[in-house]
């Protein structure tokens, strides 16, 4: 769920998601449209696709709570939970490390980016 995601992103990136990423660019945060603005925004667009696929599978992406361990900078998703919980954890783990990989190109100007400026073709999944 959303609490899992926030905690994981903070642990991996060291940033407070609510202050740094939700929202950011055209795809980080709720919803998303248009061409991603940078690599960080692409992370979120890919994550949206990951969630969309799990929605198709009937997973409750915002409500399902999963278990994971964070140690020595790595995330280990529990294999004890349901398939949906494991996949949700995998989606969130991927976006957390994607955001971390792209910290060096993070642009403060894209924080609270005005969504009507998000133009162009929304990438397909």
């Amino acid at each position: 769920g959303i609490l899992n995601l926030n905690k994981m992103v903070k642990q991996v990136t060291g940033k407070m998601p609510i202050l740094s990423y939700w929202p950011y660019g055209c795809h980080c945060g709720l919803g998303g449209r248009g061409q991603p603005k940078d690599a960080t925004d692409w992370c979120c667009q890919t994550h949206d696709c990951c969630y969309d696929h799990l929605k198709t599978q009937g997973c409750s992406i915002y409500k399902d709570y999963y278990r994971y361990n964070f140690s020595q900078g790595n995330i280990h998703c529990s294999d004890k939970g349901s398939w949906c919980e494991q996949q949700l954890c995998a989606c969130d783990k991927e976006v957390a490390f994607c955001l971390k990989r792209n910290l060096d190109t993070y642009q403060k100007r894209l924080r609270f980016y005005w969504r009507p400026h998000c133009r162009g073709q929304t990438p397909g999944c």
Partner: antibody, heavy 118, light 111 residues
Framework: QVQLQQPGTELVKPGASVKVSCKAS????????MHWVRQRPGQGLEWIGR????????NYNQKFKDKATLTVDKSSSTAYMQLNSLTSEDSAVYYC???????????WGQGTLVTVSA | DIVLTQSPASLAVSLGQRATISCRAS??????????MHWYQQKPGQPPKLLIY???NLESGVPARFSGSGSGTDFTLNIHPVEEEDAATYYC?????????FGSGTKLEIK
């Protein structure tokens, strides 16, 4: 244990509507999608659509968009499918089914045979 | 919509032998390391029963003589050794995208 209870039969006249029920028990009704599947006599299975009881979010197979309407009553843990403008082509067994983990159907109702006849 | 083509439409297998049922999808149902193909058994007058999910995972309580394999567009359900109680119609179903669709079914008869 998980149960999805459906009435055995519904006899309706051509042009009329019918509301098929599916009462769930043995699990938290609002947590999982409820699906509806049609099976004409001697034929295969067709997915009609699904509804999430927590917020009534629905997805329909376009083929059934104008034929079926899915609703839920959370207070009684019951899902409904209304079929309108019935013709003999709609005579079939209608199943409700729920998926607990991914979009494969773990639990099924016994099915309701809808017969459209004058 | 993804079309699932099952073959054969019917088959007769001797007790203790192997039954092989094929399901071919009109486009790939595999992505992100999973194949979104599932198998059901249906006996007359009963609802379908889940046998295999995600191409090869055995549903709890289903005998180990049932197995599934495949990826992309080609999938197989194997039953070995076949028992009398396996006489039924078998359906594949995908969940790669909406709408979900089923194969046309394969009727298994035990000789």
């Amino acid at each position: 244990q998980v149960q999805l209870q459906q009435p055995g039969t519904e006899l309706v006249k051509p042009g009329a509507s019918v509301k098929v029920s599916c009462k769930a028990s043995g699990y938290t009704f609002t947590r999982y999608w409820m699906h509806w599947v049609r099976q004409r006599p001697g034929q295969g299975l067709e997915w009609i659509g699904r509804i999430h009881p927590s917020d009534s979010d629905t997805n329909y197979n376009q083929k059934f968009k104008d034929k079926a309407t899915l609703t839920v009553d959370k207070s009684s843990s019951t899902a409904y499918m209304q079929l309108n403008s019935l013709t003999s082509e709609d005579s079939a067994v209608y199943y409700c089914a729920s998926n607990w983990d991914g979009a494969w159907f773990n639990y099924w109702g016994q099915g309701t045979l809808v017969t459209v006849s004058a | 919509d993804i079309v699932l083509t099952q073959s054969p439409a019917s088959l007769a297998v001797s007790l203790g032998q192997r039954a092989t049922i094929s399901c071919r999808a009109s486009k790939s149902v595999s992505t992100s390391g999973y194949s979104y193909m599932h198998w059901y058994q249906q006996k007359p007058g009963q609802p379908p029963k889940l046998l295999i999910y995600l191409a090869s995972n055995l549903e709890s309580g289903v005998p180990a003589r049932f197995s599934g394999s495949g990826s992309g567009t080609d999938f197989t359900l194997n039953i070995h050794p076949v028992e009398e109680e396996d006489a039924a119609t078998y359906y594949c179903q995908h969940s790669r995208e909406l709408p979900f669709t089923f194969g046309s079914g394969t009727k298994l008869e035990i000789k």
